[in-house]
């Protein structure tokens, strides 16, 4: 026990002594931030000039003051003891660390490209003044239902499916019911779509056939292949103009 | 059930620091985004910062920006704040909150606001 | 001074309506969703209406939220004692990078 005592002792005597040493050595070391140790006078430790700093002690020299110009604006003054800090004008935004680089702001609902603020192509969103248009949230891969429509701005609100709704209220963030993921509510409504359709027509062929057994076949033939022929009068009438989205035309979106 | 608890106010004098911290679970803390809300006594709400999960960016209120820095560690489930040059008027009562919206699944939280709240933390800036 | 504003306090009779108003501007209110906060005396906020008109599961249909332009409201039907409290409006500002909210209305129930 005794042993241990004295070997704490004689450690701390020891680097207590290396202390003094080197405060004896090194003059340098006793300068506090916002002197420094100006070689010149004797090793004396001297305050920072004008427009420059130091943030820690010992230093041999001082650092020069970041300057706020231009496009950057001062947030905190520099002092002997800390550089300034800059932020960005108005209508910019801060980039990199320590503020380095300011970009441009854009609206709600836009984005920055090499000619400027954009607005956000259909199906996508920012709503904020920086950054890029990010896709919608497709809610069926959370097994939920659209609740409210997405804007240029805002993101689509997804919402419990409706077998998971008591009228009126919802769950902000309910259970996901069992759907294998990736079937969009798009999807799913054109399969139920095409699957009525194919109903309709085999209703509506049942009752011709009942109804028309006695005119013959080649009117019935007739009738059936007029829907096959007129889409190929569509597709000709469409080629005269192309299909854009309502933000193209606006001059905004860049796919 | 979604828990938030915070801890780390107390008193401390004007320019100095304090670091708030807030132990979450009941929910995957990892997945969503985490704001500090304070109320000064008597007085209402006020937003101070928010970090995202995704991509870990952080914003903050004029009032604490170059003060104040936000921060996560998704492996202990926590939220920190850490409070520098403290002055008289940061003196308040701190809560952790936890917004809806599962990320990266949603892309943006703000339509479905703060929905798990802690109970608050009080700090008092006082010489 | 908050960015959004509201009336510091309403009042009304048990069973009766009462509408709290919250007005903003297009870089909050205008282009973003609108939620509200309930906060009973020493409690803490509780999440009432969230995207300017939908309930979280737990809250009852006496509660109800509506947008139009850069105003929001939330109105309160069939009001009970235990709805007094604070309640606040809060969203998204773009202008300035973070969330606000309202400087909070104390409802009064007579």
């Known amino acids: 026990m005794g042993n241990s005592c004295y070997n704490i002792v004689a450690t701390l005597l020891l680097v207590l002594n290396f202390e003094r040493t080197r405060s004896l050595q090194d003059p340098c070391s006793n300068c506090p931030a916002g002197t420094f140790c100006d070689n010149n006078r004797n090793q004396i430790c001297s305050p920072c000039p004008p427009n420059s700093f130091s943030s820690a002690g010992g230093q041999r020299t001082c650092d020069i003051c970041r300057q706020c110009k231009g496009v950057f604006r001062t947030r905190k003054e520099c002092s002997s003891t800390s550089n300034a800090e800059c932020d960005c004008t108005p209508g910019f935004h801060c980039l990199g660390a320590g503020c380095s680089m300011c970009e441009q702001d854009c609206k709600q609902g836009q984005e920055l490209t090499k000619k400027g603020c954009k607005d956000c192509c259909f199906g996508t969103f920012n709503d904020q003044k920086r950054g890029i248009c990010r896709p919608w949230t497709n809610c069926s891969l959370d097994g939920k239902s659209v609740l409210v429509n997405g804007t240029k701005e805002r993101d689509v609100v997804c919402g419990p499916s409706p077998a998971d709704l008591s009228p009126g209220a919802s769950s902000v963030t309910p259970p996901a019911p069992a759907r294998e993921p990736g079937h969009s509510p798009q999807i799913i409504s054109f399969f139920l779509a095409l699957t009525s359709t194919a109903l309709l027509f085999l209703l509506f062929f049942l009752t011709l056939r009942f109804s028309v057994v006695k005119r013959g076949r080649k009117k019935l033939l007739y009738i059936f292949k007029q829907p096959f022929m007129r889409p190929v009068q569509t597709t000709q009438e469409e080629d005269g103009c192309s299909c854009r989205f309502p933000e193209e035309e606006e001059g905004g979106c860049e796919l | 059930e979604v828990q938030l608890l915070e801890s780390g106010g107390g008193l401390v004098q004007p320019g100095g620091s304090l670091r708030l911290s807030c132990a979450a679970s009941?929910?995957?803390?990892?997945?969503?985004?985490m704001s500090w809300v304070r109320q000064a006594p008597g007085k209402g709400l006020e937003w101070v910062s928010v970090i995202y999960p995704d991509d870990g960016n952080t914003y903050y209120a004029d009032s604490v920006k170059g003060r104040f820095t936000i921060s996560r560690d998704n492996s202990k489930n926590t939220l920190y704040l850490q409070m520098n040059s403290l002055r008289a008027e940061d003196a308040a009562v701190y809560y952790c909150?936890?917004?809806?919206?599962?990320?990266?699944?949603?892309?943006?939280?703000?339509?479905?606001?703060?929905?798990?709240w802690g109970q608050g933390t009080l700090v008092t800036v006082s010489s | 001074q908050s960015v959004l504003t509201q009336p510091p306090s309403a009042s009304g009779t048990p069973g009766r309506r009462v509408t709290i108003s919250c007005s903003g501007s297009s870089s909050n209110i205008g282009n973003n969703y609108v939620t509200w906060y309930q906060q009973l005396p020493g409690t803490a906020p509780k999440l009432l209406i969230y995207a300017d008109s939908h309930r979280p599961s737990g809250v009852p249909d006496r509660f109800s939220g509506s947008k139009s332009g850069t105003s929001a409201s939330l109105a309160i039907s069939g009001l009970r004692s235990e709805d007094e409290a604070d309640y606040y409006c809060a969203t998204w500002d773009y202008s300035l990078s973070g969330y606000v909210f309202g400087c909070g209305t104390k409802l009064t129930v007579l």
């Open positions: 009941g929910f995957t803390f990892s997945g969503y985004d």
């Open positions: 909150a936890k917004h809806g919206g599962q990320k990266p699944t949603t892309k943006s939280s703000s339509a479905y606001g703060m929905d798990g």
